[in-house]
Interface confidence: low
C-alpha cells in the first residue's frame, strides 16, 4: 500500500514535468529505494544538476530563453570541479554561453540565478574580460590555457549550456 | 533618491494612440532592464512588455503585441511605451518596474504609475 | 502559458497573528517565484524573489518557502502595516512573466 502510494506519487509529479521534457533518464540516490533523482533525456548529470549543450547558435538573450522554456538557466559554474565537468561535452572549436553578464558595462558580472559573482571562483583566460562593451561571457577553448572563459558581445551568436537542478522523485 | 515616474496617461477613445513615458532618476537606466507591467482597476497586475538595458531586445504580452512598443532613450534616461489602437481593455494603470537579476526577472523598483483611461 | 492561483481569495487576521499565503502554479516552475505587496494607491513592492529570498530591506518576519508547483509566503507575526494585497509572480517560462490574480489581507 506505502509503495503504491509512493508510485502514485511518481507518477504525477512525471506528469508535472511532461510540458518540459517527455523523457527523464533517473538513477536511485544511495542505497535508499525511494530516493530517484532524474535528469531530462540526453541531458547530463554532474552532483544536484542537470547539464544540456545546445548546439545551435543564439545571441546571449535567446540562448538564456532557449534554456527558461526548458525549465532551466544559462550555466552557472559553481567550483572548479562543475566546469571540469562540463569541458568533458565541450568541442574544442566551439565557443558556448555562460549564464554571465555585465549588463551595464560596468565590470559588475552577474549570474543569471543572482548566484553572488565571485571573483576567486572564476576562470577568465589571461587578459580577460578586456571590453567594457563586451558584456556576456563564453567559455572556450586556447591552446595555450585550454578552457576559460571570455567577455563577447551579447548579441554575437554563440552555442551554449544550460542547468537545471535535478528531479527528485 | 532612486525613483521612477511615470507620465501620458489620460482619457483617450478607443483606436487612438499615446505615448506613456517613465523618467528614471537615482540610478543609471542603461544597467538594467525595464518592463511595463499594468493595472486594470480593481485587478491584478498583468505583465505588458520588457526591454534590454541596451534595446536590442524586446518582449510583449500577447494582449499587446503588434499595438505597443517598448523604447527607451538611455541619455535621457528615460523609458517608453507607445500604445497604439488603444481598446477598452486597455484601461489600466500602467507602471513602469526596474527588472532585477539576469534578464530582469523581478521587479525591484516600481513607479506610481499613470492611468490610461479609454472610453468613447 | 503557466498560470498561478493564489488562495484564499481573501485572508482575515489580526495583528499578531500568523499568516499563510499559498500560491500554485498549472506547471513546475522550479523555484523561480517572487511576491510582492500592494497596498490601496501604491505600487507594488518586491518581497521575496526565487522562492525564498527575501528582497532589501524586507522585515525578517515575511519568509518564502516551495518549488514546483506549490509556494507558500508567511508572515510570522502580523503588523498593522501588512495588511494589503500579495501577488505571486513566475519567471521560469517567459514571455509572459505571469501573476497570481492576488490575496487580500485584511484585519480581521
Known amino acids: 500500500n506505502f509503495m503504491y502510494s509512493k508510485t502514485v506519487k511518481r507518477l504525477s509529479k512525471l506528469r508535472e514535468y511532461q510540458q518540459y521534457h517527455p523523457s527523464l533518464t533517473c538513477v536511485m540516490e544511495g542505497k535508499d529505494i525511494e530516493d530517484w533523482s532524474c535528469c531530462p533525456t540526453p541531458w547530463t548529470s554532474f552532483q544536484s544538476s542537470c547539464y544540456f549543450i545546445s548546439t545551435g547558435m543564439q545571441s546571449w538573450t535567446k540562448s538564456q530563453k532557449n534554456c527558461s522554456v526548458m525549465g532551466a538557466d544559462l550555466v552557472v559554474i559553481n567550483t572548479r570541479e562543475e566546469q571540469d565537468f562540463i569541458i568533458q561535452n565541450l568541442k574544442r572549436n566551439s565557443s558556448y554561453f555562460l549564464g554571465l553578464s555585465d549588463p551595464g558595462g560596468r565590470r559588475h558580472w552577474q549570474w543569471v540565478d543572482q548566484t553572488p559573482y565571485n571573483e576567486n571562483v572564476t576562470f577568465w583566460h589571461s587578459g580577460e574580460p578586456n571590453n567594457l562593451d563586451e558584456r556576456c561571457a563564453i567559455i572556450n577553448f586556447r591552446s595555450s590555457e585550454e578552457w576559460g572563459w571570455n567577455d563577447i558581445h551579447c548579441h554575437v551568436p554563440q552555442k551554449s549550456i544550460c542547468k537545471m537542478k535535478k528531479i527528485y522523485i | 533618491q532612486v525613483q521612477l515616474v511615470e507620465s501620458g496617461g489620460g482619457v483617450v477613445q478607443p483606436g487612438r494612440s499615446l505615448r506613456l513615458s517613465c523618467a528614471a532618476s537615482?540610478?543609471?537606466?542603461?544597467?538594467?532592464?525595464m518592463h511595463w507591467v499594468r493595472q486594470a482597476p480593481g485587478k491584478g497586475l498583468e505583465w505588458v512588455a520588457v526591454i534590454w538595458y541596451d534595446g536590442n531586445d524586446k518582449y510583449y504580452a500577447d494582449s499587446v503585441k503588434g499595438r505597443f512598443t517598448i523604447s527607451r532613450d538611455n541619455s535621457k534616461n528615460t523609458l517608453y511605451l507607445q500604445v497604439n489602437s488603444l481598446r477598452a481593455e486597455d484601461t489600466a494603470v500602467y507602471y513602469c518596474a526596474r527588472g532585477t537579476g539576469t534578464p530582469y526577472w523581478y521587479f525591484d523598483l516600481w513607479g506610481r504609475g499613470t492611468l490610461v483611461t479609454v472610453s468613447s | 502559458e503557466i498560470v498561478l492561483t493564489q488562495s484564499p481569495a481573501t485572508l482575515s487576521l489580526s495583528p499578531g497573528e500568523r499568516a499563510t499565503l499559498s500560491c500554485r502554479a498549472s506547471q513546475s516552475v522550479n523555484n523561480y517565484l517572487a511576491w510582492y505587496q500592494q497596498k490601496p494607491g501604491q505600487a507594488p513592492r518586491l518581497l521575496i524573489y526565487?522562492?525564498?529570498n527575501r528582497a532589501t530591506g524586507i522585515p525578517a518576519r515575511f519568509s518564502g518557502s516551495g518549488s514546483g508547483t506549490d509556494f507558500t509566503l508567511t508572515i510570522s507575526s502580523l503588523e498593522p502595516e501588512d495588511f494589503a494585497v500579495y501577488y505571486c509572480?513566475?519567471?521560469?517560462?517567459?514571455?509572459?512573466?505571469?501573476f497570481g490574480q492576488g490575496t487580500k489581507l485584511e484585519i480581521k
Open positions: 537615482g540610478f543609471t537606466l542603461s544597467s538594467y532592464g
Open positions: 509572480q513566475q519567471r521560469s517560462t517567459w514571455p509572459p512573466y505571469t
Open positions: 526565487d522562492a525564498s
